[in-house]
Each structure stands twice: as C-alpha cells, then as structure tokens.
Amino acid sequence: QGWQAFKNDATEIIPELGEYPEPPPELENNKTMNRAENGGRPPHHPFETKDVSEYSCRELHFTRYVTDGPCRSAKPVTELVCSGQCGPARLLPNAIGRGKWWRPSGPDFRCIPDRYRAQRVQLLCPGGEAPRARKVRLVASCKCKRLTRFHNQSELKDFGTEAARPQKGRKPRPRARSAKANQAELENAY
C-alpha cells in the first residue's frame, strides 16, 4: 500500500536526514500558533542598547511529517519556526494579525534559532519492512540577533548552524560529547 492513501494536512518539509534547511519565513498552516518569547522591558531608544534580550521575536509552531525515501514518520513532529524580524517586546503582537509589526529603521534584528533538540521518529516503510529509527533536529527556541549592514543574506543562512556550534567556555545545548575521528561532527551536530 502506497503513501497516497496517507492523509497529510501538515506542513511537509522533506530534507535529507541530517540536513535541515531554513524554513520559509511565513508558513500558512491551520495548526500554526504565534507566541512572543524572550521578552524584556524595551529600551527607550531601541538601538542604543546592546542587550538583544530586550527584543523578542515570533515563534511559530507547525507540524510536519518526516520522510526518508518511501518511509514516513508514524506521527508528525511539532517544531518551531523562527519568523521574521524582531522588535521591542512591548510592540510585538501576541497573536497573528493583531497590532502592527514593528520594523526598525536602524540595524536589522532577525529572529533565528537559538536552541535545538533531538527527537526520535519511527519511520514506517511500505512493503512490510521493519520501522526505522531516526532522529531529527528540531528548533526548541528562537532568539533575536542584531545584524549590521555588513551582514548579508548568505551569512544569515548560517545562523542556525552558528547558534548550534559549541562556544569555548560554555556548554552548548543540545550537544554531543563523544567520539574522536569524526568528533567535529559529533561536537558540532547542533
């Protein structure tokens, strides 16, 4: 029995396993919710502060099925998409379509992934094959990052990876702590 019979009303992203492309900035999905996170007291002059925690960005929840070739996850996974630009927390709408979206005239603040988590999925395959065990990387939270005019789009695409790289002196989350020859992959998997 093919997958055609499988009703899928979730947003579907089909990456190579281990590859996680940046999701589109806006997702139309009836399961999408909007939440302002990491808010703080906004500064009187937004760009006179270096404290990015004063800014907040939208975390959109959406669901998708994970696929690998002909195999598909038994259940959809729910994850966050970090959406759009950031603004002072007080100016962010709490729900989609409510209030005005604040756009800065100075340096750009972008909403990017902050933390990732691993989640196991059980992939069901046609033809009676045993279910496969896979892990996917899901965004666990978002953060605002200040961009200067020197940042370009190609650099922006790397933020998801950058946010995941271990930093000297503190333990990244999630991270892996084993392995040698390919330790770079293990240590930088997030």
Epitope: L17, G18, R117, A118, Q119, R120, Q122, A130, P131, R132, A133, K135, V136, R137, A140, K171, R173, P174, R175, A176, R177, S178, A179, A181, N182, E185, L186, A189, Y190
Partner: antibody, heavy 121, light 108 residues
Framework: EVQLQQSGPELVKPGASVKMSCKAS????????MNWVKQSHGESLEWIGD????????TYNHKFKGKATLTVDKSSNTAYMQLNSLTSEDSAVYYC??????????????WGQGTSVTVSS | QIVLTQSPAIMSASPGEKVTMTCRAS???????LNWYQQKPGSSPKLWIY???NLASGVPARFSGSGSGTSYSLTISSVEAEDAATYYC?????????FGGGTKLEIK
Amino acid sequence: EVQLQQSGPELVKPGASVKMSCKASGYTFTDYYMNWVKQSHGESLEWIGDINPYNDDTTYNHKFKGKATLTVDKSSNTAYMQLNSLTSEDSAVYYCARETAVITTNAMDYWGQGTSVTVSS
Amino acid sequence: QIVLTQSPAIMSASPGEKVTMTCRASSSVTSSYLNWYQQKPGSSPKLWIYSTSNLASGVPARFSGSGSGTSYSLTISSVEAEDAATYYCQQYDFFPSTFGGGTKLEIK
C-alpha cells in the same frame, strides 16, 4: 564531566516489582535520550527501550512491553526504570546509557555503572 | 527484528598481531547506525566505534571499523594487552535496537 549514577543492587522475590534510578549530571538532562539495556549473567546486551526527557516520549523493545516502565524526573535529572512481575529470567545487570544528540547516529556515549537485580525466593 | 551475528565468539591473539572480528546483520543496515562497544569484566560497556568507522573519544588509533550493508568489521592493527575485552556490535537503524552476541578477545 558527564556521569550516570545508578542505584544499588536489588534482591527481590518472584512476583515483586523493583524501581531503579539513574541520576545524570554534567550535561543538560533534557537534551539527550536515555536508553536502558539489560545484560544477563555472562550474556550479551539487550536493548529495553529509551525515553526522551524533554517530552517523556518512550519507545520500548516489544519484548519488554509490560515488563519495563521508563520515567524521568526532570527536577532531579533522574531517569527511572520499573520492572514488574519479576521472575528469575529478570535477574541481570541493568544499565542506563545516554544517547548522543547527534542526528546521524543512535550511539550510546555514556553508560551508568549498572544495577544488579537478583530475583530469588 | 534485526539479528546481529558476531564471529568468532572467542579469539586469541598475541601482542602485535592484527585481528579482525566481524558482525553480520540479518538485513541490510545503514552504516551510520552501526556501532561497536568494548566491555571489560566487571565494567560497563564503552562506546568504541560509532557510525561504522568513527573512533570514540580516547580510543587508540590502532582500532578501525569498516563495512556496509550486512557485513561490518572491527580491526585492531597491532593488538596490545589492554585490548583484552568483549566487543559488541549494535544497530539502531531498525526498531528495536539490537546487539550482537559479542566477540571475546583474549591476549596470549
């Protein structure tokens, strides 16, 4: 330093239940799956199941469904496994093992010291 | 479930010898999900090789892993006394995860 500290040995009677613990330290508990593995005396390893402390999602080896129950207490960074209706077949050493967060492998990179369970009347 | 068969069950080698042990799967296993563990008597297993060929932290370079599909192997280029242990292969490509029966390496 990552450490998994398991509870001490158990001597239990047939038909009883036992609950063992695995206290994790040195890493963010909710970021890694915890696996449980059985090793009968002088034998190989058997995978019992795993739990995701982030959302309490569990997966069991069908052989151990109904026998083992995996839980976590996030406040104390502790994973638990309860074994019920014990028989002599359940006498073994039970390990908790943290699974690496790396997407492309399901390897278990840190192991507890094991909890010995002896079922005897 | 996937059955992993390790051979030989017991092997003996002299220091300096090259040894190879194998792990055969009942169905083809994706190499990323094939791992090896070392266990010494009275101790917990230790991750030794992950994803078929990557050495875990602290594992000497004399160890190597290779294979694909249904056949995998662990090789020690020049055995040392401290390598005496039982080595288990494990797959977690398919549910449930399974381990091989182990190969016990004895040093003469």
